[in-house]
């Protein structure tokens, strides 16, 4: 395969193997996978230390590493097309064996974004520096390599193999050699923990001098989560050595008989296990029976135990596990209560903010306060809300009812305000007359004037404008002007505008008079009033959006 197992470290429920060999990340992963593992994860500082230990073991044996800065693949990769996410510790990379996004990271430098190709992570080792637990290998990101071209400075890779449990190393009470063969095909004579399903071959004796006695054991699950070899008593015991060789293979005490035989024993507070070698605490808490953050508390005389939960948690029916207390059951908050693991928090409804007397109290937000009013014009604060209002000549508009839109009095409900032409302005309107007519002093009616062929008379001066309240002068029942074929205004009996339903969007071209042009013979079409125009949505200037009718008496703003 182009890779040799040089080192192995087993700890907890996993073994890490370090391999030298210039392989691509895919080839390295395939090598780990063939033996039931994956490229190693480094999900915590502790795991980083385990990986560092196995690399240190490899480097002690490996003299031929070619680069001063060596890189070893780990199982952190980012697929092609998946972009960098700077907000995450893993920056959008994920562990090849699956699993959650973990909080630990140790990037060598700021990553450059590149989504074009697959990217892989290696551990960067400076071989000129000693490997210290305080100086953990940095993560280096780069191309994943290809067969025959692993990438710059790639010297090897680290695999991880997970197991349901581990056995303790076998205890030798006399001369002999243990060889462990792991499920991932590594052989070793010194493992601090031996993975489940490993085989142990024990050859007793001192080479050719003694006839060798051999034993074969398997690391198996003897009871739920109890992993053991099933051997009884120390192995390779010899009357020649008694307790002098490796403490007789005993875990704690070794007691010699007069005939060279010996027995293992335990210190006070411990008991000898079935293997007749290992001691376990008599303390019932030593087996960690409590779960979920519960603390084991010894009972009187150390006979039994109870589990105790941290604040905000209580024991479940098993009396071993802690479950969250739902503090919200007691209604500790004025408005909203959110239960959280081990506690709770109070929240306020929309329109309120934390404050006022007492824990979890809420007070009204004054949305109308200076500098924060959401309304375009008038704002009235209410308890937990507010509403907006508009000045004369405007109605509330906008999705949230906070904007004010000019009322087009020229097409408003209740019929026309002007006898003839009507010019809408922001917040007001003006009347005008057709050629040959002049505006009466009341600003609404038209009287016959000297014949003129010019454009319709424009808006009167400021002092002549129609009153917003509406004139008391009776309106003339004149025909509405429309366009003649030649483009000059002519009178027709009536024209009716389609009635508008209040929820229909208005997309038709505007009818609003934008003010007559100053150039002779050219004028823009005025809004022509029609008694038949239904009250309902009115087009805003420009005619390209629909605004629902709003009452002018103010409307609650949307929070």
């Amino acid at each position: 395969t182009g890779a040799d197992t040089e080192a192995v470290v087993c700890v907890g429920t996993a073994c890490y193997t370090a391999h030298s060999g210039k392989l691509s990340a895919a080839e390295a992963q395939n090598h780990c996978n063939q033996n039931g593992g994956n490229l190693a994860t480094v999900k915590s500082k502790e795991e980083a230390q385990h990986v560092q230990r196995v690399l240190a073991q490899l480097l002690r044996r490996e003299a031929a590493l070619t680069a001063r800065m060596s890189k070893f693949w780990i199982g952190l990769q980012r697929e092609k097309g998946k972009c960098l996410d700077p907000s995450l510790p893993l920056k959008g990379f994920s562990w090849v064996g699956g699993g959650e996004d973990t909080p630990y990271s140790n990037w060598h430098k700021e990553l450059r974004n590149s989504c074009i190709s697959k990217r892989c992570v290696s551990l960067l080792l400076d071989l000129s520096q000693p490997l210290l637990p305080s100086r953990l290998p940095k993560w280096s990101e780069g191309p994943c390599g290809s067969p025959g071209s692993p990438g710059s400075n790639i010297e090897g890779f680290v695999c991880k193999f997970s197991f349901k449990g581990m056995c303790r190393p076998l205890a030798l009470g006399g001369p002999g050699q243990v060889t462990y063969t792991t499920p991932f095909q590594t052989t070793s004579s010194s493992l601090e923990a031996v993975p489940f399903a490993s085989a142990a071959n024990v050859a007793c004796g001192e080479g050719d001098k003694d006839e060798t006695q051999s034993h074969y054991f398997l690391c198996k699950e003897k009871a739920p989560d109890v992993f053991d070899w099933g051997s009884s008593g120390p192995l390779c015991v010899s009357p020649k050595y008694g307790c002098n060789f490796n403490n007789g293979g005993c875990h704690q005490d070794c007691f010699e008989g007069g005939d060279g035989s010996f027995l293992c024993g335990c210190r006070p507070g411990f008991r000898l296990l079935d293997d007749l070698v290992t001691c376990a605490s008599r303390n019932p808490c030593s087996s960690s029976p409590c779960r979920g953050g519960a603390t084991c508390v010894l009972g009187p005389h150390g006979k039994n135990y109870t589990c105790r939960c941290p604040q905000g948690y209580q024991l479940d029916s098993s009396q071993l596990d802690c479950v969250d207390v739902d503090e919200c059951q007691d209604s500790p908050c004025a408005q909203e209560c959110v239960n959280t693991p081990g506690g709770f928090r109070c929240e306020c409804w929309v329109g309120y903010e934390p404050g006022g007397p007492g824990e979890g109290a809420c007070q009204d937000v004054d949305e109308c306060a200076l500098g924060r009013s959401p309304c375009a014009q008038g704002c009235t604060n209410t308890d937990g809300s507010f509403h907006c209002s508009c000045e004369e000549g405007y109605v509330l508009a906008g999705e949230d009812g906070t904007q004010c839109q000019d009322v087009d009095e020229c097409v408003g409900p209740g019929g026309p305000l002007c006898d003839s032409l009507c010019f809408n302005t922001q917040g007001s309107f003006h009347c005008g007359c057709l050629p040959g007519w002049v505006l009466a002093p009341n600003g609404v009616s038209c009287t016959m004037g000297p014949v003129s062929l010019g454009p319709p008379s424009g808006p009167p001066d400021e002092e002549d404008k129609g009153e917003k309240e509406g004139s008391t002068v009776p309106r003339a029942a004149t025909a509405s002007p429309t366009r003649g074929p030649e483009g000059t205004p002519k009178a027709t009996p009536t024209t009716s505008r389609p009635s508008l339903s209040s929820d229909a969007p208005i997309t038709s071209a505007p009818l609003k008079m934008l003010a007559p042009s100053g150039s002779p013979g050219v004028w823009r079409e005025p809004s022509i009033h029609h008694a038949t125009a239904a009250s309902g949505p009115q087009e805003p200037a420009g005619g390209d959006s629909s605004v629902a009718t709003q009452n002018n008496d103010g409307t609650d703003g949307q929070k």
Epitope: A199, Y216, F217, L218, K220, K222, A223, P224, D225, W229, G230, S231, S287, S288, P289, C290, R291, S318, Q319, L320, D321
Partner: antibody, heavy 118, light 112 residues
Amino acid sequence: QVQLQQSGPELVKPGASVKISCKASGYAFSSYWLNWVKQRPGKGLEWFGRIYPGDGDTDYNGKFKGKATLTADKSSSTAYMQLRSLTSEDSAVYFCVRGDGYWAMDYWGQGTSVTVSS
Amino acid sequence: DIVMTQAAFSNPVTLGTSASISCRFSKSLLHSNGITYLYWYLQKPGQSPQLLIYQMSNLASGVPDRFSSSGSGTDFTLRISRVEAEDVGVYYCAQNLELPWTFGGGTKLEIK
């Protein structure tokens, strides 16, 4: 499919020994615990002991300590239980039972009846 | 050793109705890994026992879903929702938490 085939009934005299067998098929014999369970006539079930054929590791119920020796032959996928110094108390049906990965006794042999009588 | 207590006989049940069999242990069977190592076996007349339920509430292969089991660390109940004639026999609870493995005395299901 998994099968456990036990040897036939035995009629033995008090003080004698008997060796009963259990031939396994349909699974990796070396990798599962093989349990022996005793059932006296009209009575309940009692766990007698077990063997791990992979390395011959055994565990016995202290109540029956010294009464039996459990062995296994990997080449023939057969487990044996030798009972010694038989008394009428040992008259029972003995079942061999596979222990699975969930610690359940999932497959049972048909049982071997041992009758101790003079 | 862990000791379990079972009633020798169930209350006689009518076919099609439900039945409950209970079992009490001298020690909690809930392991610190969160698994409860309780098992139920049925021995029909003249047959070898068969596994019904493993690890407190999991149905063994081929067992109809009329069977269910529940309980806490020490008290457990096997329920048969609609008893059929083929359900008659002796029901044993067992623990595989600690050696030696132990069985309850067995409860005989009786039909009215």
